[in-house]
């Protein structure tokens, strides 16, 4: 199966751990470190706030 884009951290995201549990076998996600799925979501939300996508806000 193809890897979902939000399953893998991007280098520029900083404190990030992969959403895919196979990529994070130790389960080290903490309050300070967001999963890649959440960061992908939040980055999209921020882009929309800046008017890149649907421009609501």
């Amino acid at each position: 199966l193809p890897t979902l884009p939000w399953s893998v951290c991007q280098e520029e995201w900083g404190d990030c751990l992969p959403s895919d549990p196979d990529l994070d076998p130790v389960g080290t996600i903490t309050n300070e470190t967001k999963s890649s799925a959440e960061l992908y979501f939040l980055k999209t939300v921020l882009q929309q706030k800046d008017g890149i996508e649907d421009g609501l806000g």
Partner: nanobody, 119 residues
Framework: QVQLQESGGGLVQAGGSLTLSCAFS????????MAWFRQAPGKERKFVAG????????YYDDSVQGRFTISRDNAKNTVYLHMNSLKPEDTAVYYC????????????WGQGTQVTVSS
């Protein structure tokens, strides 16, 4: 002041389904992206799913991908989490959260609703 009120939790057998609702009030719903989180006993709160402001884009944690569906009804100011093929490890308190476009966190949180999946 924004208020988020979750409902729909309960006890369900493994393999069953539940739909959680989160009613939003106090401000303009479409100004906020919405997300569901869960916190299992003794564990940290974890992102489950998110939906963007207008609703077409959805994001899921790998642990629920293909089993859970997040949706929103902007006419009813409500976000939903449809949960299918539930597993005992889905047992947790489920929270909804509203985000106005801040990567570092969420503007508002609900009080949570308990979901218990028995084997």
């Amino acid at each position: 002041q924004v208020q988020l009120q979750e409902s729909g939790g309960g006890l369900v057998q493994a393999g069953g389904s539940l739909t959680l609702s989160c009613a939003f009030s106090g401000r303009t719903f479409t100004h906020y992206a919405m997300a569901w989180f869960r916190q299992a006993p003794g564990k940290e709160r974890k992102f489950v799913a998110g939906v963007t402001r207008s609703g077409p884009n959805t994001y899921y944690d790998d642990s629920v991908q293909g089993r859970f569906t997040i949706s929103r009804d902007n006419a009813k100011n409500t976000v939903y989490l449809h949960m299918n093929s539930l597993k005992p490890e889905d047992t947790a308190v489920y929270y909804c959260a509203a985000n106005s476009g801040v990567v570092s966190g969420y503007d508002y949180w609900g009080q949570g609703t308990q979901v218990t999946v028995s084997s």
